[in-house]
């Protein structure tokens, strides 16, 4: 007997599509080697028609393909628009030749039944409603009127004009007559289910006078759509459930064995593990939503079910919408952590990944929110000025080209524990999540700024210095001024990584900036970083205010770290050419602060394109240039 | 919740024919498939045959050891899967149970089944 597994017969009619399994053994070698579906003809010869090396027979262009899933052990053949000439016997098999493992399959293709010739066909969806239509002669108008369902041997009630209503149908069928026309009535339908398909006769009058009419009602469940995601990237599952439902509850589930389950609604319900990686989006007034999960899991695969009901719940006779979800372990997305440790107090440096081919997109970093349908308002954005509250201690670095961005966060606090995505306004697939976890710190901070209650006087010296321990001898450290648009690096003069030391003295690692002489554009925040080529390690941040200098007084630094730092001044400065560009206020990017969805995150964009570059290092100079000087001890 | 309710078992003679009947209520879903397992005396329970349909395609899976001689078929309108059983032999001896699931993988594989009848004893006497 034959290793491989199918279904044996299948059945169909013209204009339909098939969508046949394969199940083989789960061997490396079944797994990697060529998977066809051939013809069998009289001569016992098997003709392929479609293979995994990307052959297509003339017959099946545009309408067939044939997809492994070596993680499942099975193949699909799919065709559509089938005719009866696709009736045959077929093999769907393993092998560089056609004799090698297979499986026969019988494909039967029929013509749609031929039904009585006066017969009207209603074909709907499942959970719509159905309006028929019943004509009938002016002498039958005081007749009674009834609609009944064709059973083998009866013809069984549904409803007639006595108000008599069959049980199954009761507060879903109506009969009525519209306006004053004495010729027609109706009967609608509504909630319909599979088992309301079939043949129905409606009818007005008694004996050989009455009126008759026969009627197909066809229920159609929905086809699933397929969709083919990539590990770790993000799936959108756009549901339109019509007018209707506009006012019901909305829900996303994932059918099992047994039911479906619920993993989003509209009242607030969602699973967990679906946490932080999941938004539902009301997208109008005509029952259109959508849903967005990001960071696709191996085990996000599965068929999905979208509906409508009050009870956020799937329900029997309610309009839905289906998908096939593959998610494709051979990703293009790189496996980046998921999960980001910080303590209080200290600094995350989170590496997004995005579309290389798309270096130029905008780039933003949100904070998921899963209160009510989930949103995820913008912190931070390459033309998205940061949200206030996070002034001082958020920057978002672009490297233009590859592949990454990186979002610092310092100055943590357990109240930043939570899920943030990554995303651009281009390839949407490429959104990622994050969660940060922040512990209360237990030691020391790597970095650590002196003076720590930094007030500079204007037209003077001002010194800061950042401590680093021995493990951050060998990485770039940087001092950079914070804006809302940015971490803008000041130039460095690194003395210290240039020198050859065996020995690490503990005490003495810093790095220095000084502001020489001092301006009222000082005042702000400051970071101290390390960073080892283009990626991002620690932070500190420092908020320098400037005073102008009270009479009498002479301003003293407070450290011999300071007092050290002047001398490194006299012996060489570098000029920063620094300066802020133009603080112009841009609207937030996204979808998000707003709570908009986040699809409208590329189209917002689109619109602040007119604004600055945040983590760069260029910038026009002022009229009177702060002198900055990196030095290490 | 489905209920499944088996019948048409019965003891028959080697060669002779038997039409088993699943009868489906309660919730019933837009996709579905319905199967035949047995059990004999002593031995683990093993698939027969499934139907699976979607709208008006229909799929049917039978076990190696049927050979042509059992149909599985369906009545939409009734809810209801027969299997057909020609040609019977003394070892298709078994209790037959009816199975059924929203959401098919491996048709053979009995944990994809989420619904199961009480079965229904059918004896072939040589």
């Known amino acids: 007997k034959s290793p491989i597994f199918g279904p044996q017969e299948v059945s169909s009619i013209e204009g339909d599509s098939v969508s046949i399994t394969c199940y083989y053994p789960d061997t490396s070698v079944n797994r990697h080697t060529r998977k066809y579906w051939c013809r069998q003809g009289a001569s016992g010869m098997c003709t392929t028609l479609i293979s995994s090396n990307g052959y297509l027979s003339k017959e099946y262009s545009g309408r067939a393909n044939l997809i492994n899933f070596p993680e499942n052990n099975t193949f699909v053949i799919n065709i559509e628009q089938l005719t009866q000439d696709d009736t045959g016997s077929y093999k769907c098999g393993l092998g560089t030749s056609n004799r090698g493992l297979s499986f026969d399959v019988s494909l039967e293709v029929s013509q749609v039944p031929e039904l009585p010739s006066d017969t009207h066909v209603y074909t709907k969806d499942i959970g719509r409603n159905v309006t028929i239509e019943c004509p009938f002669k002016r002498e039958n108008a005081p007749s009674k009127k009834s609609l009944c369902k064709k059973t083998n041997q009866s013809c069984e009630l549904v409803i007639d004009s006595t108000e008599k209503v069959n049980p199954s149908y009761i507060g879903r069928a109506k009969l009525f007559m519209k306006g004053t026309d004495l010729t027609v009535f109706y009967v609608n339908i509504s909630h319909l289910t599979h088992n309301d398909a079939g043949l129905y006769i409606c009818q007005a009058g008694e004996g050989p006078s009455a009126d008759k009419k026969n009627v197909d009602l066809q229920v159609l469940a929905p086809e699933p759509e397929l969709l083919y995601k990539d590990l770790r990237s993000s799936v959108t599952f756009e549901c339109d459930l019509g007018r209707e439902v506009a006012n019901e509850a909305k829900y996303l589930c994932r059918m099992n064995k047994e039911t479906c389950d619920v993993i989003i609604n509209t009242l607030g319900k969602r699973d967990p593990d679906f946490e932080g990686r999941i938004l539902i989006t009301p997208k109008d007034d005509n029952g259109r939503f959508s849903v967005l999960i990001t960071g696709l899991r191996k085990e996000d695969a599965g068929h999905y079910q979208c509906g409508a009901h009050s009870s956020g719940l799937p329900q029997e006779g309610w309009p839905i919408q289906t998908w096939q979800l593959f998610v494709n372990e051979e990703s293009t997305i790189p496996n980046r952590r998921s999960v980001v440790k910080g303590v209080t107090g200290g600094s995350v440096a989170i590496a997004c990944p995005y579309n290389p081919k798309e270096s130029s997109s905008l780039k933003y970093w949100c904070r998921w929110e899963g209160d009510g349908n989930g949103h995820c308002p913008v912190l931070v954005g390459t033309q998205a000025q940061v949200q206030e509250e996070y002034e001082g201690r958020l920057a978002l670095f672009d490297q233009p080209g590859n592949g990454t961005y990186t979002v610092i966060l310092n100055q943590l606090t357990t109240e930043d524990a939570g899920f943030y995505w990554c995303l651009t306004n281009g390839d949407s697939r490429w959104r990622t999540t994050i969660e940060l976890q922040v512990a209360e710190a237990t030691r020391e901070p790597n970095l650590e700024v002196t003076p720590q209650n930094a007030t500079a006087v204007l037209g003077e010296t001002f010194t800061v210095s950042c401590h680093y321990p021995c493990k951050f001898y060998s990485q770039e450290k940087y001092w950079c001024k914070w804006s809302n648009k940015g971490c803008h690096i000041l130039p460095s003069h690194d003395e210290g990584a240039r020198q050859s030391s065996v020995s690490c003295d503990q005490s003495s690692q810093l790095v220095s900036m000084t502001l020489n002489p001092v301006s009222k554009e000082d005042e702000g925040w400051y970071w101290c970083g390390v960073k080892q080529g283009q990626t991002y390690g620690e932070t500190t941040a420092i908020y320098i205010a400037v005073e102008e200098r009270t009479r009498g007084s002479s301003h003293v630094n407070p450290t011999d770290a300071n007092a050290r730092a002047k001398v490194a001044l006299e012996e060489e400065v570098v000029d920063s050419s620094i300066s802020e560009k133009e603080n112009k206020a841009i609207p937030n990017p996204g979808p998000f602060a707003n709570e908009r969805e986040i699809q409208n995150v590329g189209d917002q964009a689109q619109e602040n394109r007119a604004s600055g570059d945040a983590g760069s290092a260029d910038g026009q100079s002022r009229s009177s240039s702060s002198k900055h000087h990196h030095h290490h001890h | 919740q489905v209920q499944l309710v088996e019948s048409g078992g019965g003891l028959v003679q080697a060669g002779d024919s038997l039409r088993l009947s699943c009868a489906a209520s309660g919730r019933t879903f837009p996709t579905y498939a319905m199967g035949w397992f047995r059990q004999a005396p002593g031995k683990e329970r093993e698939f027969v045959a499934t139907?699976?349909?979607?709208?008006?395609?229909?799929?049917?899976y039978y076990a190696d050891f049927v050979k042509g001689r059992f149909t599985i078929s369906r009545d939409n309108a009734k809810n209801t899967v027969y299997l057909q059983m020609d040609s019977l032999k003394p070892e298709d001896t078994a209790v037959y149970y009816c199975?059924?699931?929203?959401?098919?993988?491996?048709?053979?594989?009995?944990?994809?089944?989420?619904?199961w009848g009480q079965g229904t004893q059918v004896t072939v006497s040589s």
């Open positions: 139907i699976r349909w979607s709208g008006s395609t229909q799929y049917k």
């Open positions: 199975a059924a699931t929203t959401l098919l993988g491996d048709p053979r594989a009995l944990n994809e089944y989420a619904y």
